[in-house]
């Protein structure tokens, strides 16, 4: 099939006092091979500080996956989610509050 770019969505949730979990989700993409990773101040986080979901079919002939990491509350602006897929790339910031979600579709 032809390339379908992902929709990228960054969310945040309370983890423990003073910490939040930030999750970067990519969905609706084809083919399956996608890079999704967190950066702090532009530097890649080590593998052992990130958690990945498997790349799974979403039932529409496309795929979905996610990556999450735990960060200190108040330091959200230092973190970005990086995505590479089929020759395209993008970076996505952490939303400033619980009610904000960032959705980006990339072509």
């Amino acid at each position: 099939g032809s390339t379908v770019p992902p929709m990228v969505n960054v969310t945040r949730s309370e983890a423990s006092e003073g910490n939040i979990t930030v999750t970067c989700r990519a969905s609706g993409f084809y083919p399956w091979n996608i890079t999704l990773s967190w950066r702090q101040d532009g530097v890649s986080l080590s593998h052992d500080t990130q958690q990945w979901g498997d790349v799974l079919p979403d039932g529409n002939g496309t795929y979905q996956t996610w990556v999450a990491t735990r960060i200190c509350q108040g330091e959200e602006q230092r973190f970005t989610c990086y995505m590479e897929h089929s020759g395209n790339h993008s970076t996505h910031p952490v939303p400033s509050g619980n009610s904000h979600h960032h959705h980006h579709h990339h072509h």
């Epitope: 950066r39 532009g42 080590s46 593998h47 790349v55 089929s86 395209n88």
Partner: antibody
Framework: QVQLKESGPGLVAPSQSLSITCTVS????????VNWVRQPPGKGLEWLGM???????DYNSALKSRLSISKDNSKSQIFLKMNSLQTDDTARYYC??????????????WGAGTTVTVSS | DIQMTQTTSSLSASLGDRVTISCSAS??????LNWYQQKPDGTVKLLIY???SLHSGVPSRFSGSGSGTDYSLTISNLEPEDIATYYC?????????FGGGTKVEIK
């Protein structure tokens, strides 16, 4: 097919700088990371750093002050620059494509390497 | 940095033998381990990624296993073209680090 080829000066004088070019084919630099790895004679492999599809770089902190990695997407070339070379920088320098898929991160295709000797 | 140790720097085996190469990490690396083969001419190839996944085009006689800090590469039926040095590499923490290598020779 995916290929990477390194080209370098061969010989560099101590305290001088090193510039190596990695020319790639079969894939786009805008959507792939490329790594630099070196191997001193008779020794093991050492990761130097990498450049991502968006041009962002990660470096081995032990060498970060002397290293610079850049690229030219239109020419399909990646550049390694290293300053203040000493004799223990004598090594074979490789570029390698990175595959970064969730829990699976690896260097799936390597160049043949270019030998750099630091000597006066 | 995480130290990777391959205690056997070289070994001799007969054609058809089962050969096992060991690698240990200075701390747990959660299966974030790859194996590479370097031929005498310096050519490097990926064999195994994420502890046990066989890279495409690699013969099925190669297999990987392990967990925690201890990992191994097995060649089930040694062939002449397997004469090479084998390196393990962790990517749990940055920078990625390699073991010192195990050279496999024919008896």
């Amino acid at each position: 097919q995916v290929q990477l080829k390194e080209s370098g000066p061969g010989l560099v004088a101590p305290s001088q700088s090193l510039s190596i070019t990695c020319t790639v084919s079969g894939f786009s630099l805008t959507g792939s990371g490329v790594n630099w790895v070196r191997q001193p004679p008779g020794k093991g492999l050492e990761w130097l750093g990498m450049i991502w599809g968006d041009g962002n770089t990660d470096y081995n902190s032990a060498l970060k002050s002397r290293l610079s990695i850049s690229k030219d997407n239109s020419k399909s070339q990646i550049f390694l620059k290293m300053n203040s070379l000493q004799t223990d920088d004598t090594a074979r320098y490789y570029c390698a494509r990175g595959a970064y898929y969730g829990k699976r991160w690896y260097f799936d295709v390597w160049g043949a390497g270019t030998t750099v000797t630091v000597s006066s | 940095d995480i130290q990777m140790t391959q205690t056997t720097s070289s070994l001799s085996a007969s054609l058809g033998d089962r050969v096992t190469i060991s690698c240990s990490a200075s701390q747990g690396i959660s299966n974030y381990l790859n194996w590479y083969q370097q031929k005498p001419d310096g050519t490097v190839k990926l064999l195994i990624y994420y502890t046990s996944s066989l890279h495409s085009g690699v013969p099925s006689r190669f297999s990987g296993s392990g967990s925690g800090t201890d990992y191994s590469l097995t060649i089930s039926n040694l062939e002449p073209e397997d004469i090479a040095t084998y390196y393990c590499q962790q990517y749990s923490k940055l920078p990625p680090t390699f073991g010192g290598g195990t050279k496999v020779e024919i008896k």
